[in-house]
């Protein structure tokens, strides 16, 4: 398939409201940029089950963002 148009967010739609903590391998946060004007929370699942976008407005996402920011700053 061809490349996607530039300026596109990585996630489609609002994202899932929650992911089982036991299924999470890692969490990545993409902050607003020229390509996407919103924060995106991407969850990598264990056992090669791919990735899911977490709704950044969900309680779980807010906790993850807080945790990551605490770790980084």
């Amino acid at each position: 398939f061809p490349m996607f148009k530039r300026g596109r967010c990585l996630c489609i739609g609002p994202g899932v409201k929650a992911v089982k903590v036991a299924d999470i391998e890692k969490a990545s946060i993409m902050y607003p940029s020229n390509n996407c004007d919103k924060i995106e929370v991407i969850i990598t699942l264990k056992e090669n089950k791919g990735q899911r976008c977490l709704n950044p407005k969900s309680k779980q996402a807010r906790l993850i963002i807080k945790k990551v920011e605490r770790k980084n700053f």
Epitope: R8, C9, L10, I12, G13, V16, I42, G50, C53
Partner: nanobody, 126 residues
């Protein structure tokens, strides 16, 4: 109970048109991306088009670009696939699927979709 029900398939001559519908129930429509896939006899299931219910973002496979149009009516929880200038190679069973939390990089990965319809047959004769 979650349900995706496709309709609108049939037999059409090459160059003709069909409109497929995918009626969804049992989940929050706005949270999901709805994809259309197709499977021809002896071939793997392939992605055709998808739409994000929340922001109406769309994407098409190269093979259908300019011929197929996907749209959604959120009030009816229904996604439509308007298929014009049909070719014999479009012959397949067409399925709709719903996935939440999808990434643009994995929209054609069938395992990422949570719910599937039963399919509707589209046959294009030459």
């Amino acid at each position: 109970e979650v349900q995706l029900v496709e309709s609108g398939g049939g037999l059409v001559q090459a160059g003709g048109s069909l409109r497929l519908s995918c009626a969804a129930s049992g989940f929050t429509f706005d949270d999901y991306a709805i994809g259309w896939f197709r499977q021809a006899p002896g071939k793997e299931r392939e992605g055709v088009s998808w739409i994000s219910s929340s922001d109406k973002d769309t994407y098409y496979a190269d093979s259908v670009k300019g011929r197929f149009t996907i749209s959604s009516d959120n009030a009816k929880n229904t996604v439509y696939l308007q298929m014009n200038s049909l070719k014999p190679e479009d012959t397949a069973v067409y399925y709709c699927a719903a996935g939440a939390g999808l990434l643009i990089a994995t929209i054609w990965t069938t395992q990422m979709y949570d719910y599937w319809g039963q399919g509707t047959q589209v046959t294009v004769s030459s």
